[in-house]
């Protein structure tokens, strides 16, 4: 939602968290600002304090309940407002009618672990965190592997077009240090975006056996 020079973007993690970023040109200095969430069909409402993340942008997380509780559904609409203190009052700086399941961004996958490693291949698994049961199997993943001497941006993306929480990396170099990351995205939602990348998992391939071609 954009008001003049203001941009207000929020994502739902599919369970009990709405994360918001508000940016504004000619930023207000020393002003207290909040995000207020008012669902259209729920008894609760929630507030979080916007904290600066850069010169002209602020962020906060609306914690709606216990991490794995299903606080919103596909039919909910939540009015989200940015309110900033002026004098003793609050001023509405930005507003949007937020459809949570149209604006999804899941939590980064967790519990990455090496299941099996060889000289040229490595089998890695992970888990998704705080993802709604509504998705059933309608999720996709992207993975990337950091090779020595390269950057993450240079790493080719591997796409898994189904809910598959493991991958077998092939054609790796023996006795080499790698890092691996994965991210997840539901298939649902017009403005849905990829989760953040997982924490990198470092692993090393096994050295080639001396005198043998493996």
């Amino acid at each position: 939602a954009v008001n003049g020079t203001s941009q207000f973007t929020c994502f739902y993690n599919s369970r009990a968290n709405i994360s918001c970023v508000w940016s504004q040109d000619g930023a207000l200095q020393d002003t207290s600002c909040q995000v207020h969430a008012w669902p259209d069909r729920r008894r609760w409402n929630q507030t979080c304090e916007l904290l600066p993340v850069s010169q002209a942008s602020w962020a906060c997380n609306l914690i709606l309940g216990a991490p794995d509780s299903q606080k919103l559904t596909t039919v909910d609409i939540v009015t989200l407002r940015v309110l900033c203190r002026e004098g003793v009052r609050w001023r509405v700086m930005a507003i949007q009618d937020f459809k949570p399941f149209e604006n999804l961004r899941l939590m980064a996958p967790i519990s990455l672990q090496v299941v099996h490693v060889e000289t040229h291949r490595c089998n890695i698994s992970w888990e998704i965190s705080q993802a709604s049961h509504y998705f059933e199997r309608h999720l996709e993943f992207e993975a990337r592997t950091l090779s020595p001497g390269h950057t993450w941006e240079e790493a080719p993306l591997l796409t898994l077009k189904q809910k598959q929480e493991w991958i077998c990396l092939e054609t790796l170099t023996p006795d080499t240090q790698y890092e691996f990351q994965v991210r997840v995205k539901p298939l649902q939602g017009e403005f849905t975006t990829w989760s953040p990348w997982s924490q990198p998992l470092a692993f090393r391939t096994k050295p080639a056996a001396l005198g043998k071609d493996t």
């Epitope: 504004q24 000619g26 207000l28 003793v88 009052r89 609050w90 001023r91």
Partner: antibody, heavy 121, light 112 residues
Framework: QVQLQQSGPELVKPGASVKMSCKAS????????ISWVKQRSGQGLEWIGE????????YYNEMFKGRATLTADKSPNTAYMKLSSLTSEDSALYFC??????????????WGQGTSVTVSS | DVLMTQTPLSLPVSLGDQASISCRSS???????????LEWYLQKPGQSPKLLIY???NRFSGVPDRFSGSGSGTDFTLKISRVEAEDLGLYYC?????????FGGGTKLEIK
């Protein structure tokens, strides 16, 4: 219906103080802001400041800072304004007015009838 | 502080005539949230002010549709399409975009 009932006229001496009241009814006192506005005879309106009774937070127009003190008491639903070190310039009609805690549309929707203050020796 | 200047100071009209009051601000009163908090209040003789118009052109509840507000940036106008006896009094513009909030000096609408 929303009503703001202000205290009666005051005749005070220069250098003295005066405290006027504004009793609210017909709405939840703690959910709205009370603003105070000054009107000198034959002149315009000046915004003095306001108080949010919910947490007693105040804000003053710099022109009135230090001489105006705004307070509120939630049990009789009453807001107060104390003016100190009075001079003839303070002779005026003082209004209280209700305002939404979130300034979404307008500053003040309902006004009291005003308290007349005359500063004279 | 934002200075609000109203013209004319006095506006003599005949009942049934159209009346137009101008209000000019010393600086742009578009708030950083893109709204313009320009309000009009009417103070009838011996009474307290009453809200007529908010956010430039929105009529407050119960205000007759003969009252209309317009303008943008620094120039604003209140129009009364057919003046009635009950419309006589002092009209004030007010800006609520920049603290401290300020009123115009007032325009007296009176019978010609």
């Amino acid at each position: 219906q929303v009503q703001l009932q202000q205290s009666g006229p005051e005749l005070v001496k220069p250098g003295a103080s005066v405290k006027m009241s504004c009793k609210a009814s017909g709405y939840r006192f703690s959910d709205y802001v009370i603003s105070w506005v000054k009107q000198r005879s034959g002149q315009g309106l000046e915004w003095i400041g306001e108080i949010y009774p919910g947490d007693a937070q105040t804000y003053y127009n710099e022109m009135f800072k230090g001489r105006a003190t705004l307070t509120a008491d939630k049990s009789p639903n009453t807001a107060y304004m104390k003016l100190s070190s009075l001079t003839s310039e303070d002779s005026a009609l003082y209004f209280c007015a209700r305002g939404s805690y979130t300034y979404d549309n307008y500053a003040m929707d309902f006004w009291g009838q005003g308290t007349s203050v005359t500063v004279s020796s | 502080d934002v200075l609000m200047t109203q013209t004319p100071l006095s506006l003599p009209v005949s009942l049934g005539d159209q009346a137009s009051i101008s209000c000019r601000s010393s600086q742009n009163i578009v708030h950083s949230n893109a709204n313009t908090y320009l309000e009009w209040y009417l103070q009838k003789p011996g009474q307290s002010p009453k809200l007529l118009i908010y956010k430039v052109s929105n009529r407050f509840s119960g205000v007759p549709d003969r009252f209309s507000g317009s303008g943008s940036g620094t120039d604003f106008t209140l129009k009364i399409s057919r003046v009635e006896a009950e419309d006589l009094g002092l009209y004030y513009c007010f800006q609520g975009s920049h603290i401290p909030w300020t009123f115009g000096g007032g325009t007296k609408l009176e019978i010609k």
